[in-house]
């Protein structure tokens, strides 16, 4: 178990032309929060899908007002860190998903307007424990600047938070078969819990509330001894006809080591023989290190003088991966702004650029806003190879000539029906909710009985209980 | 996912005062709107009061009056300060939240409240 922290250092407009219009107004004050979203491994799913490592929502920022006429400053940010905490391992590569959203303190019925401003994601690889790490990413004329750790919680300790550590009983050293537990040198490592009631002379465990037998006993605890007089054969007899007890399978059936390795049983267990590279109990961890030249296509290898510390690759333009072994297509970042079109020619990257658009990236915009309205007290931006209007609140359309519709957002919950009214938006309830904007069900289970979902229930408004 | 744990109930005579606490975590409240419930012995459970994220309130009409629902951001909590209380109040209370961003409606475990003499 153990935390996931990250810290927001800022965010603003980032580098280069076209600098965002600022998210607030006088007129409409604004204040910013961030949320983020944690997958296991290097997976590329859609954003849609569940924060299976967790997910968090920061405080909000400070109140922001824009001055008139100035630029987009980097914006005030809410207090402190965003923690994710997680029950289980550490995976070590992790996918995240960072989204900084705009709460608009204007006189919305029934509560404040949110909208998304920035969506960033990545894919990482992070020991716990290790220090802070240092990011940068763009979303858009939109720039993040962050970090972020993984921390075990104690007792967990290692780069997974698999280890667990308890404080020395004794000053001097462990008890017999428990190591010390670096950093931290006055605890030791904790002997594993094994189930409840388990025999302690004749089972053991290798993992947290399991109950192994030793040889010659059986049953869940590991308290009824294996008859074998009478038995078929020494490893299975029947006890549906001989009344003999079956003792579970042999350590090595189904083969627990990894990687290759091969399994030998001992008198209290097994033993795992494992091939050049692995190692641990069941050959589970690699222990390659840079002498084995673990990088592809000229990567610089890092670190990783003895097995224990990992090696990093430093990837050559063109190839990334943790071995540098996957050919970038370097198309598929975007580097080519205002929908050019990339080509990927090998030794280099040409963009091909839209009308109204050049320079080697089509960064530069020829269109310009002379002579061109946008109502309603909208502005003219330019981009695109044409003029667009930005569009005061409440108007919408290419040259904000239409009112915009309060309800877009589905601001009535559970099937309450929104109304567009001159100061916002009214929520008609369905039956049996009530709250300014449909939030509480009056009878929210149709029985005496929990946990019953409440009548009516759609998939866009689940229920959780705890 | 956001966390729930109720606190306050016990023991009160008819027409005596009682606070129940709700704090919240893994969320700020102020991103949700809350409510307390509660539910007697064989009926349904049902609202009592309710909290938006605006700060307007909402109560069932056998306690307007006599219960107020109030929110406190920095604490991360919500209150339901019950007076003038009286023998059909007895039941459990249920915290409750509904988080916009997600649409998720979340519930705590319950405290119970005894108004008898």
């Known amino acids: 178990a153990g935390v996931f922290e990250l810290q927001i250092h800022s965010f603003g407009p980032g580098p280069g032309p076209g600098a965002p219009r600022s998210p607030c107004s006088a007129r409409l004050p604004c204040r910013l929060f961030f949320r983020v979203c944690l997958k296991p491994g290097l997976s590329e799913e859609a954003a849609e899908s569940p924060c299976a490592l967790g997910a968090a929502l920061s405080a909000r920022g400070p109140v922001y007002t824009e001055q008139p006429g100035a630029p987009a400053p980097d914006l005030p940010l809410p207090d402190g860190l965003l923690q994710v905490p997680f029950r289980d391992a550490w995976p070590g590569t992790f996918s995240f998903i960072i989204e900084t959203w705009r709460e608009e303190l204007g006189d919305q019925i029934g509560g404040p307007a949110w909208s998304l401003l920035a969506r960033v994601a990545g894919r990482r690889r992070l020991a716990a424990g290790g220090p802070w790490a240092r990011d940068i990413q763009r979303a858009g004329a939109w720039e993040l600047r962050f970090s972020y750790r993984a921390r075990c919680e104690p007792p967990a300790v290692g780069t997974a938070c698999t280890r667990l550590c308890r404080p020395r009983s004794a000053p001097s050293r462990c008890g017999p078969g428990l190591r010390p537990c670096a950093p931290l040198e006055d605890e030791c490592e904790a002997p594993l819990v094994c189930r409840a009631g388990c025999s302690p002379e004749h089972g053991f465990c290798e993992q947290p509330g399991e109950c192994r037998c030793l040889e010659g006993w059986t049953g869940p605890l590991c308290t009824v001894p294996v008859s074998t007089s009478s038995c078929l054969s020494p490893r299975g007899p029947s006890s549906a006809t001989t009344g003999c007890l079956v003792p579970g399978p042999g350590p090595c059936d189904g083969n627990p080591c990894a990687n290759g390795g091969s399994c030998s049983e001992t008198p209290r267990s097994f033993e795992c023989t494992c091939p050049r590279g692995f190692y641990g109990l069941r050959c589970e961890v690699s222990g390659v290190t840079c002498a084995d030249g673990p990088c592809f296509n000229g990567g610089l290898c890092v670190g990783g003088a003895d097995p224990d510390s990992a090696y990093i690759c430093h990837c050559p333009p063109g190839f990334q991966g943790s071995n540098c072994e996957k050919r970038v297509d370097r198309c598929s970042l975007q580097p080519c702004r205002n929908g050019g079109l990339c080509l990927d020619l090998g030794h280099a990257l040409r963009c091909r650029c839209r009308a109204g658009f050049a320079g080697p990236r089509c960064e530069h915009d020829l269109d310009d806003c002379a002579g061109r309205a946008c109502a309603n007290g909208g502005t003219c931006v330019e981009g695109g190879g044409a003029h667009r209007c930005s569009c005061a609140l409440g108007f919408g359309g290419r040259d904000c000539r239409e009112r915009a519709d309060p309800c877009a957002a589905r601001p009535c919950a559970h099937g309450g029906r929104c109304y567009a009214h001159f100061s916002g938006l009214v929520c008609a309830c369905a039956p049996g909710y009530m709250g300014a904007r449909c939030e509480f069900p009056v009878h929210p289970d149709g029985a005496s009985a929990l946990p019953a979902a409440p009548p009516g229930l759609r998939p866009g408004d689940p229920q959780r209980y705890l | 996912e956001v966390q729930l744990v109720e606190s306050g109930g016990g023991l009160v005579q008819p027409g005596g005062s009682l606070t129940l606490s709700c704090a919240a975590s893994?969320?700020?409240?102020?991103?949700?709107?809350m409510a307390w419930y509660r539910q007697a012995p064989g009926k349904k459970r049902e609202l009592v009061a309710g909290?938006?994220?605006?700060?307007?309130?909402d109560y069932i009409d056998s306690v307007k009056g006599r219960f107020t629902i109030s929110r406190d951001n920095a604490k991360n909590s919500v209150y339901l300060q019950m007076n003038s209380l009286r023998a059909e109040d007895t039941a459990v209370y249920y915290c409750?939240?509904?988080?916009?961003?997600?649409?998720?409606?979340?519930w705590g475990q319950g405290t119970l409240v005894t108004v008898s003499s």
């Open positions: 409750y939240a509904y988080r916009w961003l997600t649409r998720y409606t979340y």
């Open positions: 893994r969320s700020s409240v102020s991103f949700l709107s």
């Open positions: 909290i938006s994220t605006d700060g307007s309130t």
